[in-house]
C-alpha cells in the first residue's frame, strides 16, 4: 500500500510504499501465544497525528492506523546528507479478539525501537528484502519497501539508497582509505554479570566482556575503524522477559544504548542471540548519531535450560559497519533455574582449542 503525508500546501513530504507483517507474542489464559498478521489493505494514514514537522521544532512522522485501534508510526530525522526512520513504534490493542484471540489482558500496549532504515537526502530508501524491526514482543517485517521523507514535490526521487540486505556482498571488500590517526587497539574489555528478571523470575543470566567494532566516515571524509570497550562501571542494565523474546538493554556512559534480543525456537527448544541494536554518538563522525541493527542473527545458541559458554573471543557481525566482539561469554536465556547457570554447552571454538 502507498501512504502519504502532505503539508498545508498539499505537497507530500513523506511517501511510503510497503507491505508489513507483524508477529506479536502475547499471553492467553492457556499460556503464551504468537500471532502473525499482515498490515491490511484498508490501513490508512492518520492525518491528525502524522506531520511534515513543524519548523524548527519537530521532525516528520507517518502514523498508519488499522483494525481496532492499532497504529504503526515511523518517526523521521535528518542531517545535512542523510535521513532515517529514527524510531518505529507500534501500538496494539489486545482487546481486538480478531487479532489477539483469548488474550488474558485487554490493555493497549506500546512498543518501539530504533531502525536501520536510512537513505541519502533527496533519494528514496529501497528495500526489496525483508527489513525486520524488533520491539519487545513484536517483530515488524517490511517487504518491498520504498520510503522517502523530506520530499518537496510529491513524487519519489529518481535516485535510491538500497538497504544492506539488497546489496550484493562483494567477495573481497575494497580497502578503506587510510586513516591519519588510527585508534589504538584497546585492551580486552572487562567482564561483567548481567541478569534480567520478570514476574516469573530470572529469564536472562549473562557474564561477558563487550567491545564494539565500528567503521564510519569522519568529518574529513576518511574512513576509520574504532574499537570501543563497554565499561561495566559506567553501564546500567535493564531488560524484559517475554515468552518468545528476552531483551537486555545496556546504557553506557550516557551516549550508548546497546540492545541484545534473545529468541527461542520452540520446535527445537533452543535459545539464541537473535538481534543486536546499537545507538551511539561518535563525535568525530560525519554523521555523529551512529545507529545499527540486525534482527536476523543466530549466535550464542544453546538448549533452553542449558547455558552457552565460550572462552574464545566471538565476533558477531551486525552490519557491514558494526560488529560486537564478545569476550568470555556465559549466557542463558528464557529458563534459568534458581538464578544459576545450567549445564554448559561449550562453543566450537573452545572445543577445537582443547
Amino acid at each position: 500500500a502507498m501512504f502519504m503525508v502532505k503539508n498545508g500546501q498539499g505537497t507530500a513530504c513523506i511517501m511510503a510504499q510497503f507491505s508489513a507483517a507483524f508477529s506479536v507474542n502475547y499471553d492467553t489464559k492457556s499460556g503464551p501465544k504468537q500471532m502473525t498478521f499482515d498490515l491490511p489493505s484498508d490501513a490508512t494514514v492518520v492525518l491528525q497525528r502524522s506531520s511534515c514537522g513543524k519548523e524548527q521544532t519537530s521532525d516528520p512522522s507517518l502514523v498508519i492506523a488499522f483494525g481496532r485501534g492499532h497504529t504503526l508510526t515511523l518517526n523521521f530525522t535528518r542531517n545535512a546528507t542523510r535521513y532515517s526512520v529514527q524510531l518505529m513504534s507500534f501500538v496494539y490493542n489486545l482487546s481486538d479478539t480478531h487479532l489477539f484471540p483469548n488474550a488474558s489482558s485487554k490493555e493497549i500496549k506500546t512498543v518501539e525501537s530504533i531502525t536501520d532504515i536510512r537513505a541519502d537526502i533527496d533519494k528514496k530508501y529501497r528495500c526489496v528484502s525483508g527489513t525486520q524491526v524488533h520491539m519487545n514482543n513484536v517483530t515488524v517485517t517490511l517487504h518491498d519497501a520504498t520510503i522517502q521523507a523530506y520530499l518537496s514535490n510529491s513524487s519519489f526521487s529518481r535516485g535510491e539508497t538500497r538497504c544492506e540486505q539488497d546489496r550484493p556482498s562483494p567477495t573481497t571488500a575494497p580497502p578503506a582509505p587510510p586513516s591519519p590517526s588510527p585508534s589504538p587497539v584497546p585492551k580486552s574489555p572487562s567482564v561483567d554479570k548481567y541478569n534480567v528478571s520478570g514476574t516469573n523470575g530470572t529469564c536472562l543470566l549473562a557474564s561477558m566482556g563487550l567491545q564494539l567494532n565500528l567503521t564510519y566516515e569522519r568529518k574529513d571524509n576518511t574512513t576509520v575503524t574504532r574499537l570501543l570497550n563497554i565499561n561495566p562501571n559506567k553501564t546500567s542494565a535493564s531488560g524484559s522477559c517475554g515468552a518468545h523474546l528476552v531483551t537486555l538493554e545496556l546504557h553506557s556512559e550516557g551516549t550508548t544504548v546497546l540492545l541484545f534480543q534473545f529468541g527461542m525456537n520452540a520446535s527445537s527448544s533452543r535459545f539464541f542471540l537473535q538481534g543486536i541494536q546499537l545507538n551511539t554518538i561518535l563525535p568525530d563522525a560525519r554523521d555523529p548519531a551512529f545507529k545499527a541493527a540486525n534482527g536476523s542473527l543466530r549466535a550464542l545458541q544453546a538448549t533452553v535450560g542449558n547455558s552457552y559458554k565460550c572462552n574464545a573471543e566471538e565476533h558477531v557481525r551486525v552490519t557491514k559497519a558494526f560488529s560486537v566482539n564478545i569476550f568470555k561469554v556465559w549466557v542463558q536465556a528464557f529458563k534459568v533455574e534458581g538464578g544459576q547457570f545450567g549445564s554448559v554447552e561449550e562453543c566450537l571454538l573452545d572445543e577445537n582449542s582443547m
Epitope: 535528518r78 518537496s152 571524509n221
Partner: antibody
Framework: QVQLQQSGAELVKPGASVKMSCKAS????????IHWVKKSPGQGLEWIGA????????PYSQKFKDKATLTADKSSSTTYMQLSRLTSEDSAVYYC???????????WGQGTLVSVSA | DIQMTQSPPSLSASLGGKVTITCKAS??????MAWYQDKPGKGPRLLIH???TLQPGIPSRFSGSGSGRDYSFSISNLEPEDIATYYC????????FGGGTKLEIK
C-alpha cells in the same frame, strides 16, 4: 520567492579571520541545506561545505575542513561562514547557495568578495 | 571526496558552431550531474541538472548526456552571449565541481 542576501565585501590582513553572513528568506529555513562555494580566478568554482540548519550538521570538503567553519542561527534564518588564518590564496568571491532538493544548486546569493592583503 | 576531471580547460569556436565539454567522475555518480554557466561579475547560472534536464528558460541549444562516470555537455548554434566559463557539478555523494572550461569565440 527564495532570496539569499550576503554581507558586504571584506578587506583583511593575512593571518586574520573573517566571518560573512547569508540571510535566507522566502522559504522554511530549516528545510534545506545552505552550501558555500568559492570562486577564484585560479581555481574556478569550489564547493566548501554545507550546513543543515535544522541541527547544525555540517559536512566539509576535505580541502576546506581546517579553513572554514559553518554555523546557522535559526532565529534569524542566517547562515555564517568563518574563514581562519587567511592568506592571499583565500582572496575570492564566496557564494552561499541553496539546492532545490535534487535539482543541484539552484539559488545563489550575490556573493561576498574577500580580499586578503597586507 | 569524488574528483571531477573536466576537459578541455579552454576552447575556441565559431559563431553558429557547436562545442562539447566532458567531465569524468572518479566513481559512478548515477547521473547526478549539473552544468553551470559563469560570467565575470555575475553569479553562476544553473543550465542543466540530472545530466540532461534543462532548467526552465534555458534554450534547447544547450544539452547534456552521460551515465556512470562519463558525462558531456554541448552547445550548438553558438551565440555571442555564450562566452563564459562552464562548470560541471556532481551531487551524488557530497558535491564537487569540475575545473571549468573557458569558452571563447573565434
Amino acid at each position: 520567492q527564495v532570496q539569499l542576501q550576503q554581507s558586504g565585501a571584506e578587506l583583511v590582513k593575512p593571518g586574520a579571520s573573517v566571518k560573512m553572513s547569508c540571510k535566507a528568506s522566502g522559504y522554511i529555513f530549516t528545510n534545506y541545506n545552505i552550501h558555500w562555494v568559492k570562486k577564484s580566478p585560479g581555481q574556478g568554482l569550489e564547493w566548501i561545505g554545507a550546513i543543515y540548519p535544522g541541527n547544525g550538521d555540517a559536512p566539509y570538503s576535505q580541502k576546506f575542513k581546517d579553513k572554514a567553519t559553518l554555523t546557522a542561527d535559526k532565529s534569524s534564518s542566517t547562515t555564517y561562514m568563518q574563514l581562519s588564518r587567511l592568506t592571499s590564496e583565500d582572496s575570492a568571491v564566496y557564494y552561499c547557495v541553496r539546492a532545490n532538493w535534487d535539482v543541484a544548486f539552484a539559488y545563489w546569493g550575490q556573493g561576498t568578495l574577500v580580499s586578503v592583503s597586507a | 571526496d569524488i574528483q571531477m576531471t573536466q576537459s578541455p580547460p579552454s576552447l575556441s569556436a565559431s559563431l553558429g558552431g557547436k562545442v562539447t565539454i566532458t567531465c569524468k567522475a572518479s566513481q559512478d555518480i548515477d547521473r547526478y550531474m549539473a552544468w553551470y554557466q559563469d560570467k565575470p561579475g555575475k553569479g553562476p547560472r544553473l543550465l542543466i541538472h540530472d545530466t540532461s534536464t534543462l532548467q526552465p528558460g534555458i534554450p534547447s541549444r544547450f544539452s547534456g548526456s552521460g551515465s556512470g562516470r562519463d558525462y558531456s555537455f554541448s552547445i550548438s548554434n553558438l551565440e555571442p552571449e555564450d562566452i563564459a566559463t562552464y562548470y560541471c557539478l556532481q551531487y551524488d555523494n557530497l558535491w564537487t565541481f569540475g575545473g571549468g572550461t573557458k569558452l571563447e569565440i573565434k
